[in-house]
Amino acid sequence: GHWGAWMPSSISAFEGTCVSIPCRFDFPDELRPAVVHGVWYFNSPYPKNYPPVVFKSRTQVVHESFQGRSRLLGDLGLRNCTLLLSTLSPELGGKYYFRGDLGGYNQYTFSEHSVLDIINTPNIVVPPEVVAGTEVEVSCMVPDNCPELRPELSWLGHEGLGEPTVLGRLREDEGTWVQVSLLHFVPTREANGHRLGCQAAFPNTTLQFEGYASLDVKYPPVIVEMNSSVEAIEGSHVSLLCGADSNPPPLLTWMRDGMVLREAVAESLYLDLEEVTPAEDGIYACLAENAYGQDNRTVELSVMYAPWKPTVNGTVVAVEGETVSILCSTQSNPDPILTIFKEKQILATVIYESQLQLELPAVTPEDDGEYWCVAENQYGQRATAFNLSVEFAPIILLESHCAAARDTVQCLCVVKSNPEPSVAFELPSRNVTVNETEREFVYSERSGLLLTSILTLRGQAQAPPRVICTSRNLYGTQSLELPFQGAHRLMWAKIGP
């Protein structure tokens, strides 16, 4: 043999009961002691520290705390050092060391020791993970190391959680004993937080101990709080709320179009949108997720706003006789009333649509001009002006003429045309053509579709020549011999040099 001891590293017992600490020891056979003595020390193995003597086989002298409360159950001669401690009180909790005394110089304190824990509540063992819908086993374990007093177990608050199974007295790895009772049940999410109790009672005594455990039932999230569809005016503040019930608390995520906007581990999560814009209109999803499952719900946010400035797509330059198609579109919520005007005359209108098509078949020069597209809803009105340019061959207006005044002849040629034409004055009798580029003789001025050209001839009043006005653009040419009017009929103002 060799020096060594075997005892449970830890042992527990209820306050007021007793405890038997099983203990065996060994020593070298050649020491052959005539008598084996032993000492149990409390809390320190060093005799120099004068630890309290729990038991000493050589004498009856023990520390006052252990007076009448300690007894050796084992036979030291048989290398059994089992100790019995009675009427346990909290201050007896601690380390217990055995010292073998074989006489001579052979006293040996074993480093192996027992830690006694004086308890006053049964130990309810709940698995580290209790999941809703999955059967669980909860056990109540109490020490049963007092040969004089045996505990009886009962469950408290287990109604609806199944009937207990009593396993009885079980031996643990290190030689200590426990009484065990089991409870099997399938927890629901409602069982989370349920307080389950176990009672250990000692028959024929008033000793009774209770312990409780709160069930921590894990379950997947269910979204229980969520806005129904939300309408908000552009520029206002919007708060979307998502609340979920789960254990552990879920990771709540607000998403839009697959993009995470906000997330947090919480039971509820607000998504605050400051000064909402139409861009934020759409479907928002809340995802609640924990290790046990997930749930998701969506909410539609409608941002109400005045129409945007309409945009005009389509033909803005057309040739006389063509069909013109113009699309006016905008964006608003709700959809607007769209109207196209020309000179306060409604040409087309549509209600609660975001676009309006204007069709002008076979345009005439009269269709040329400024148009307005107006979009309107209860939040505002916006308008966009656009010009339709109708292109056509020149038309020399009948107001074109020549007139004499003192010694000067002035010829006025007024042409309506798009695009701007060229104008030339022809004097056939003289075989002369004067172009508008000859600024000495011709003055031209354009106003809208009208081009007014004035030819001034000096010293021609007595015998005025014939004058033909010819106007040309890419669509055609028109010529007109300008009628001559008397002085009394000529009413014009000279503009320019």
């Epitope: 001579g104 052979n106 480093s111």
Partner: antibody
């Protein structure tokens, strides 16, 4: 040099008590155990027990429990043997003897007695 | 307890001659953990305390003349004085210190 000097001879009546001292010098007192050995007139040596001078813990041989007490005063490096209720058969020379102790952790190993005191004769007679 | 028995009880040897004292233990004093014999020899002259001669069965204490030697193992041990000197007249004790300490009854050595 190592010296163990014991107190002088004692003549005591039966039933009385006696206290023998053993003063150590020339070494560290608490590094060695102190043994007590009895030698009755014309007889052999009898080991009475020893006291651990470091811990103060006494160990008594089976024949020397009850009336015999070992004690220490480490401040003056002195060990004491007290015998109470003296009997005629306690008449003997009492020796103190040191033994080396090798400490390791909470335990130790004791070795042979190497130095002895000169002895104290205790005579018990009415 | 381990009982130590010495032989002879007394011994007379001429000066310069070898003296041999035997000691037998009731149980082995060889300690398995360090393979040492926990046996010592003491010399005691009249009116003096015992003096350590040998320990570990064969290790001579410092200052002890080399004519003293010890041998043996387990249960049988011998103290040998190779050449007896007049000052060697004394009582010799064997002593085991493995278990509860015990001494032999002593051997008285005289000059023949």
């Amino acid at each position: 040099q190592v010296q163990l000097v014991q107190s002088g001879s004692e003549l005591k009546k039966p039933g009385a008590s006696v206290k023998v001292s053993c003063k150590a010098s020339g070494y560290t007192f608490t590094n060695y155990g102190m043994n007590w050995v009895r030698q009755a007139p014309g007889q052999g040596l009898e080991w009475m027990g020893w006291i651990n001078t470091y811990t103060g813990e006494p160990t008594y041989a089976d024949d020397f429990t009850g009336r015999f007490v070992f004690s220490l005063d480490t401040s003056v490096s002195t060990a004491y043997l007290q015998i109470s209720s003296l009997k005629a058969e306690d008449t003997a020379v009492y020796y103190c003897a040191r033994n080396p102790i090798n400490y390791y952790g909470i335990n130790y190993e004791g070795y042979v007695m190497d130095y002895w005191g000169q002895g104290t004769l205790v005579t018990v007679s009415s | 307890d381990i009982v130590m028995t010495q032989s002879p009880d007394s011994l007379a040897v001429s000066l310069g001659e070898r003296a041999t004292i035997n000691c037998k233990s009731s149980h082995s004093v060889l300690y398995s953990s360090n393979q040492k014999n926990y046996l010592a020899w003491y010399q005691q002259k009249p009116g003096q305390p015992p003096k350590l001669l040998i320990y570990w069965a064969s290790t001579r204490e410092s200052g002890v003349p080399d004519r003293f030697s010890g041998s043996g193992s387990g249960t049988d041990f011998t103290l040998t004085i190779s050449s007896l000197q007049a000052e060697d007249v004394a009582v010799y004790y064997c002593h085991q210190y493995l278990s509860s300490l015990t001494f032999g009854q002593g051997t008285k050595l005289e000059i023949k």
